[in-house]
């Protein structure tokens, strides 16, 4: 039952997209006082596993040692303290990257963009798809996602972006999935470096910020959650 | 519910100024370029200046070019334009309105009036 | 700068009835083309972007179709709330152009 105590946090290392076959540790970080971790899976008996905590008991490991398409899902962990069971904590999304064939990206019309114009990377598939992702390198969150209308099985998404700036370029890739399941990605497509030269008007200094590319709103950030963070891509559904 | 909000017009003189603001809310406005696009009388749309979402990067329609200045305070979710040396011709309904990072504008104000007459 | 010539500029039509606008742009705008509409003393509104996708709460009786120079906007079924001027504008390339209207009417 869920108390007044405080929420873990629940965390991937080395992080959260994790490729066929590697080992992954998922960390739930609670109180000094937590006697017991829970974490519990989307779509699975509860709990999904329990760990003792390791000293000095503020958090606990559970380990994945090769990343299968069983592992890929949403997670929530909880811990308990002498006076019962915490809040969940925010849910962690576990992506497996590998499941399917590798998509390609290219930008229309050049992967050479002036500012204040405008380009459209594509993502085609070799096999229909529903979901294409695109991520930009080094973008604080970098997924971004765009579904196919209806459901229906597509071979390609286009992601446009204008006015581009400076800050768009980068280094692209992107990623097809079916959309019964999310956690489930192909292969990464091979990168794409869009270059953007010098501004048509008023270039000022870049701040040091991470900002938006493609098919979302400019600069808006997405969560593989949805949510809106403060920064990076925004996810994009069609 | 993403709100955009214009004050600031009125009447002036040719030649003088005048200086508009958005007021934004229902988004995190630090995230989004932002654009002004006037509506002279009975006339269609015509786009103004852009700003990118940190101000990084700014541009202007050629016919305001030098006399406009479009800014942003992320801090007080509020956008700007300061138009100086007033003509006639910018006689016009000013919207501000959000970019959606596609080409287009996906939110827009209601609107301030700015009348420029002798 | 891009050039956007809409037609009709005016149009009167029945509800019920299916209409169609067309923009043409000067030079290839690829699909940056949007479509907005206008009620008397009201700010527009986005209804189409990127030529064909659906702006968030649009009645999916408004659809657009092009690529290049020639797109074309259409209303499958007229309601009488569909009464407004409709706009086109390429998003191609700053400066950001808009067509010159077209105002919808009842027969």
């Known amino acids: 039952q869920a108390g007044p105590l405080p929420k873990p946090t629940l965390w991937a290392e080395p992080g959260s997209v994790i490729s066929w076959g590697n080992s992954v540790t998922i960390w739930c970080q609670g109180t000094l006082e937590a006697r017991e971790y829970r974490l519990d899976k989307e779509e699975s008996p509860a709990p999904w596993d329990r760990q003792n905590p390791l000293e000095p008991k503020n958090k606990a490991r559970f380990s994945i040692p090769s990343m299968t398409e069983d592992y890929a899902g949403r997670y929530r962990c909880y811990y308990r303290s002498p006076v019962g069971w915490s809040q969940p904590s925010d849910p962690l999304e576990l992506v497996m990257t590998g499941a399917y064939s590798k998509p390609t990206l290219s930008a229309l019309p050049s992967p050479l963009v002036t500012s204040g114009k405008s380009v459209t990377l594509l993502c085609q598939s070799r096999s229909p798809m529903d979901t294409f992702l695109l991520i930009k390198e080094r973008a604080a969150h970098p997924l971004l996602h765009l579904r196919s209308e209806h459901g229906a099985q597509q071979h390609q998404a286009e992601f446009p972006m204008s006015p581009v700036t400076s800050v768009h370029g980068g280094t692209y890739r992107c990623f097809s999935s079916h959309g019964f399941s999310h956690y489930l990605l192909s292969h990464p497509s091979d990168p794409l470096e869009l270059i953007v030269s010098g501004s048509l008007e008023d270039p000022r200094p870049s701040p040091t910020r991470s900002v938006s590319t493609a098919a979302g709103p400019e600069d808006q950030p997405l969560m593989p959650t949805g949510s809106v963070p403060h920064s990076g891509l925004r996810r994009h559904w069609e | 519910e993403v709100q955009l909000v214009e004050s600031g017009g009125g009447l002036v003189q040719p030649g003088g100024s005048l200086r508009l603001s958005c007021a934004a809310s229902?988004?995190?406005?630090?995230?989004?370029?932002m654009h002004w696009v006037r509506q002279a009388p009975g006339k269609g749309l015509e786009w103004v200046a852009y700003?990118?979402?940190?101000?990084?990067?700014?541009y202007y329609a050629d016919t305001v070019k030098g006399r406009f200045t479009i800014s942003r305070d992320n801090a007080k979710n509020s956008l700007y334009l300061q138009m100086n040396s007033l003509r006639a011709e910018d006689t016009a309904v000013y919207y501000c309105?959000?970019?959606?990072?596609?080409?287009?504008?996906?939110?827009w104000g209601q609107g301030t009036t700015v009348t420029v007459s002798s | 700068d891009i050039q956007m010539t809409q037609s009709p500029s005016s149009l009167s039509a029945s509800v019920g009835d299916r209409v169609t606008i067309t923009c043409r742009a000067s030079?290839?705008?690829?699909?940056?083309l949007n479509w907005y509409q206008q009620k008397p003393g009201k700010a527009p509104k986005l209804l189409i972007y990127y030529t064909s996708r659906l702006h968030s709460g649009v009645p999916s009786r408004f659809s657009g179709s092009g690529s290049g120079t020639d797109f074309t906007f259409t209303i499958s079924s007229l309601q009488p709330e569909d009464i407004a001027t409709y706009f086109c504008?390429?998003?191609?390339?700053?400066?950001?152009?808009f067509g010159g209207g077209t105002k919808l009417e009842i027969k």
């Open positions: 309105a959000r970019a959606d990072g596609r080409g287009a504008m996906d939110y």
């Open positions: 700003i990118f979402s940190g101000s990084s990067t700014i």
């Open positions: 229902g988004f995190t406005f630090s995230d989004y370029g």
């Open positions: 030079q290839d705008i690829s699909k940056f």
């Open positions: 504008q390429q998003g191609n390339t700053l400066p950001w152009t």
